[in-house]
């Protein structure tokens, strides 16, 4: 058989091979397509078939205009004029070229070592649904899971059978890496002698991360002054994309805790006392240090705040200006 | 709103002739395949014509295959049914409806027509 | 040509009941029938195309089905308004052939 592929609502002609041009013809046009349920038997005379597959004068079948229903397979069986029966066997396919694609919500910068989402390409109308590939700097970016990351999304018109792609990029630029990325998306139907359709190119800024604006070190109760049995609980509140990791130091050392950015201080007693703070560490700007809290453990109605422990303000915040 | 309206119906003697016609709107006519259905009196239905959207095909039942010419002008949205050498079986009411491909299954139908051919 | 037997040619029933009408086709015409609806003294209304599929703007109690070339048109729970004539009708093939009809009153 012949693979024919026919663009949606164009006309399309398939030749009975063998038949006489002129009748009288000997000859049987038979379909099975979306529009039958087994083989079905097209009239010599014509009828309410025609206006979707007519047997045209010279024995061709004419379809008008194809459409999603038409796909299947089409045969004809004719007796040629030497009485030899000659068959012709066609598969058809039909597709749709859909508009341009197009980015949308495109980012308008990246920012290096953290996920950034590029935009959304969209193509509506493709018959059947092709697929969407992003190119980076001309080259085909294959998505790995972790640095390129591809959300894809096929929706079908109920009405029409057409179908619409959306293909949502996001990304982890690589620091030090291209400076100014340029993205583009292309929509391929996959089929032979069909070039992809590109988007126009998005060109965008790779920021690197800037280190913390600054460290703040959030001790509550207020003044960090508690009774015992109290609980004391101690924010380190830091400004940076990705968050750092957070290690905390009493007295100048390291405590041995898992990192966060969370020190929970319960039922305290003497043995907490001491100075508090905590240790960012931003993969590309090294550590940096709050300045330090004082935590005393005293009966209220003690004296004052201690001294390095939060004064005036009242809002037992301590802020290091980078 | 899709409207179908025939006319030109009436009483006429056996083997004389008769036009009805079917003015629509609300849709666009030209895309549709055309139908013209009768009725007999205390009868059934009875296809009598169809014409393809272009009015390049016809179709008819050996019943009036020869005596009547289904037409359309789609520049003035107007379907025609020209009746010769009428017949005493052809008394009906004569409906204009659209479709008769597989596509169009006779969604809309006119109001209908009474042709009665009686000497 | 094809032939439609319609049956019955009439029935006579209660308000609320279910009622199934049927057409049987004399070859195979797949898909492509209608049923229409006919009140007296107005032109027929199209309830069911291509055998299954509900015409917009009627009730959910009509339905239509196919087993082989046996096509039926049920109205279940029939209320007044439904009191009229039925016709089936094959458009696969020339010449198109309507059904005899079934008309329905209530008892």
């Known amino acids: 058989g012949q693979n024919i592929t026919a663009r949606i609502g164009e006309p399309l002609v398939l030749s009975c091979k063998g038949a006489p041009k002129k009748p009288p013809q000997q000859l049987e046009w038979k379909l099975n397509t979306g529009r039958t349920e087994a083989w079905k038997v097209l009239s010599p005379q014509g009828g309410p078939w025609d206006s979707v597959a007519q047997i045209l004068p010279n024995g061709s079948l004419l379809l008008p205009a194809t459409g999603i229903v038409d796909e299947g397979t089409f045969r004809c069986r004719a007796t040629n004029r030497r009485g030899k029966e000659v068959k012709s066997n066609y598969r058809v396919r039909v597709y749709q070229i859909p508009g341009k694609p197009e980015i949308v919500d495109p980012a308008s910068e990246l920012t290096a070592s953290v996920p950034n989402k590029v935009g959304t390409c969209v193509s509506e109308g493709s018959y059947p649904a092709g697929t969407l590939s992003w190119h980076l700097d001309g080259k085909l970016l294959i998505p790995d899971g972790k640095e390129t990351l591809v959300k894809e999304e096929t929706r079908r018109h109920p009405e029409t059978g057409l179908f619409t792609l959306r293909s949502e990029l996001t990304v982890i630029p690589t620091q030090g890496g291209t400076t100014h990325p340029t993205f583009s998306c292309s929509f391929s139907l996959g089929l032979p002698r069909r070039r992809p359709l590109n988007t126009a190119p998005i060109q965008l800024r790779v920021r690197e991360p800037g280190p913390p604006e600054g460290i703040q070190l959030l001790v509550e109760p207020e003044g960090g002054i508690v009774a015992p049995g109290g609980t004391v609980t101690l924010t380190c509140a830091i400004s940076a994309q990705p968050p750092p990791q957070v290690h905390w130091i009493k007295d100048g050392a390291p405590l041995p805790l898992a990192p966060s950015p969370v020190l929970l201080l319960p039922e305290v007693g003497h043995a907490d006392e001491g100075t508090y703070s905590c240790v960012a560490t931003h993969p590309s700007h090294g550590p940096q240090e709050s300045p330090p809290v004082s935590i005393r453990v005293t009966e209220t109605g003690d004296e004052g705040p201690a001294e390095g422990s939060v004064g005036e303000s009242g809002l037992g915040t301590l802020a290091l200006a980078l | 709103e899709v409207q179908l309206v025939e006319s030109g119906g009436g009483l006429v003697q056996p083997g004389r002739s008769l036009k009805l016609s079917c003015v629509v709107s609300?849709?666009?006519?030209?895309?549709?395949?055309m139908t013209w259905i009768r009725q007999t009196p205390g009868k059934g239905l009875e296809w009598v014509a169809s014409i393809n959207n272009s009015g390049d095909n016809t179709y008819y039942p050996d019943s009036v295959k020869d005596r009547f010419t289904i037409s359309r002008d789609n520049a003035k949205s107007t379907l025609y049914l020209q009746m010769n050498s009428l017949r005493s079986e052809d008394t009906a009411t004569y409906y204009c409806?659209?479709?008769?491909?597989?596509?169009?299954?006779?969604?809309?139908w006119g109001q209908g027509v009474m042709v009665t051919v009686s000497s | 040509d094809i032939q439609m037997t319609q049956s019955p040619s009439s029935m006579s029933v209660s308000l609320g009941d279910t009622i199934t009408i049927t057409c049987r086709a004399s070859?195979?015409?797949?898909?492509?029938v209608n049923w229409f609806q006919q009140k007296p003294g107005k032109s027929p209304r199209r309830m069911i195309y291509r055998a299954t599929n509900l015409a917009d703007g009627v009730p959910s109690r009509f339905s239509g089905s196919r087993s082989g070339s046996i096509y039926s048109l049920t109205i279940s729970s029939l209320e007044s308004e439904d009191v009229a004539d039925y016709h089936c009708?094959?458009?696969?093939?020339?010449?198109?052939?309507f059904g005899s009809g079934t008309k329905v009153e209530i008892k």
């Open positions: 070859q195979d015409v797949g898909i492509y």
């Open positions: 009708l094959e458009f696969d093939e020339h010449p198109l052939t």
């Open positions: 409806t659209r479709g008769g491909d597989i596509t169009t299954g006779f969604d809309y």
């Open positions: 609300g849709f666009t006519f030209n895309n549709y395949w």
